[in-house]
């Protein structure tokens, strides 16, 4: 499987909510000996590899925000901790995987990464990630609602296998 990022850039006004999305592509094993771990974190555009560094999102670590389930099952964070920080990550039956951030501030601007790991009994992890930029704007130049910019066809096909 691979991970696609439908949008590479989200430009939002301060105070707005946004949902960042990744999509799982390709065959997904639904066997009993496989588990999927999905999470979100902030990172920086490394010279060598984007998404290597794992920084917290609003003080919540990648472990605080992770989902853990089999196959294409639906899941979402029910953690009070995440919701108290205005965050919720979710995964549906169709391979879509998202994080919703409420009441955006300028401090939320930056690079966001989704990570999906297939964990299988007796096998090494299969790790894939996607990256997207969030720009939170204020003042007269800010849009009234979030504007999303699709990934180029090259980006969405040149999908990162970590």
């Amino acid at each position: 499987f691979k991970v696609a990022t439908p949008y590479s850039l989200y430009v939002c006004p301060e105070g707005q909510n946004v949902t960042l999305t990744c999509r799982l592509l390709g065959p997904v094993d639904k066997g009993h000996d496989v588990t999927f771990y999905k999470t979100w974190y902030r990172s920086s555009r490394g010279e060598v590899q984007t998404c290597s560094e794992r920084r917290p999102i609003r003080n919540l670590t990648f472990q605080d925000l992770h989902l853990h389930h089999g196959g294409h099952q639906a899941a979402n964070t029910s953690h009070d901790l995440a919701q108290r920080h205005g965050l919720e990550s979710a995964s549906d039956h169709h391979g879509n995987f998202s994080i919703t951030m409420r009441n955006l501030t300028l401090l939320d601007s930056g690079l966001y990464c989704c990570l999906v790991v297939e964990i299988r009994h007796h096998h090494s992890e299969h790790r894939v990630h996607g990256a997207m930029e969030l720009q939170v704007q204020t003042g007269k130049d800010a849009p009234s609602n979030c504007v999303v910019y699709p990934s180029s066809s090259q980006d969405s096909e040149n999908i990162t296998a970590a």
């Epitope: 490394g46 060598v48 590899q49 290597s52 794992r54 992770h66 853990h68 964990i119």
Partner: antibody
Framework: QLQLQESGPGLVKPSETLSLTCTVS??????????WGWIRQPPGKGLEWIGS???????YYNPSLKSRVTISVDTSKNQCSLKLNSVTTADTAVYYC???????????WGQGTLVTVSS | DIQMTQSPSSLSASVGDRVTITCRAS??????LAWYQQKPEKAPKSLIY???SLQSGVPSRFSGSGSGTDFTLTISSLQPEDFATYYC?????????FGQGTKLEIK
């Protein structure tokens, strides 16, 4: 603050089974998204990964030891156990338990316990 | 198995020196490399993950770089507490493997 504490006999006879326990405090051993691993270090030598157990029960062993090793978890006691059978003097080492999150390295370690294999 | 080879195996340096330790993987491991510091009679401590990311609480004089097969750990200005043994570890695939270690001693 997560703490890991290894315990078990410090002396084991050749051909017998080495049994160690790692007791976890300050966190749940059944928390999803973590592996619980064992690493050993013979006196004056380097580190060797023995194996790891994922929170959902999946196990991963070093092929060099796979035929002799078993890692298991007791969630009721918040403990992870290592069993290594048919030991020889080459198994004399400091044994560490450690935790690593998914797709990450070992970020929390116990202080280690020395096990000597001798008759 | 992926073999990890560190060099040098030992190194003498003085407080204030800049020190570099290298680690080479026998096959590509992307950025799935960690560096640890170990002091006598103590457990290893994680310094760097993902080849170049600093573990929380680790002083900024430590830095890592590299990708694929060649990696380096750099200490920009040695402090007295930095004299220890350093290990690299790949966590790209099982079995996880460590370098043989580099012992950093006071000159």
């Amino acid at each position: 603050q997560l703490q890991l504490q290894e315990s078990g006999p410090g002396l084991v006879k050749p051909s017998e089974t080495l049994s160690l326990t790692c007791t976890v405090s300050g966190g749940s051993i059944s928390s999803s998204g973590y592996y619980w691993g064992w690493i050993r270090q013979p006196p004056g030598k380097g580190l060797e990964w023995i194996g790891s157990l994922y929170s959902s029960g999946y196990t991963y062993y070093n092929p060099s030891l796979k035929s002799r090793v078993t890692i298991s978890v007791d969630t009721s006691k918040n403990q992870c156990s290592l069993k290594l059978n048919s030991v020889t003097t080459a198994d004399t080492a400091v044994y560490y338990c450690a935790r690593h999150p998914v797709a990450m390295n070992f970020d929390d370690w116990g202080q280690g316990t020395l096990v000597t294999v001798s008759s | 198995d992926i073999q990890m080879t560190q060099s040098p195996s030992s190194l003498s340096a003085s407080v204030g020196d800049r020190v570099t330790i290298t680690c080479r993987a026998s096959q590509g491991i992307s950025s799935w490399l960690a560096w640890y510091q170990q002091k006598p009679e103590k457990a290893p401590k994680s310094l760097i993950y993902a080849a170049s990311s600093l573990q929380s609480g680790v002083p900024s004089r430590f830095s890592g770089s590299g990708s694929g097969t060649d990696f380096t750990l750099t200490i920009s200005s040695l402090q007295p507490e930095d004299f220890a043994t350093y290990y690299c570890q790949q966590y790209n695939s099982y079995p996880y493997t460590f370098g043989q270690g580099t012992k950093l001693e006071i000159k």
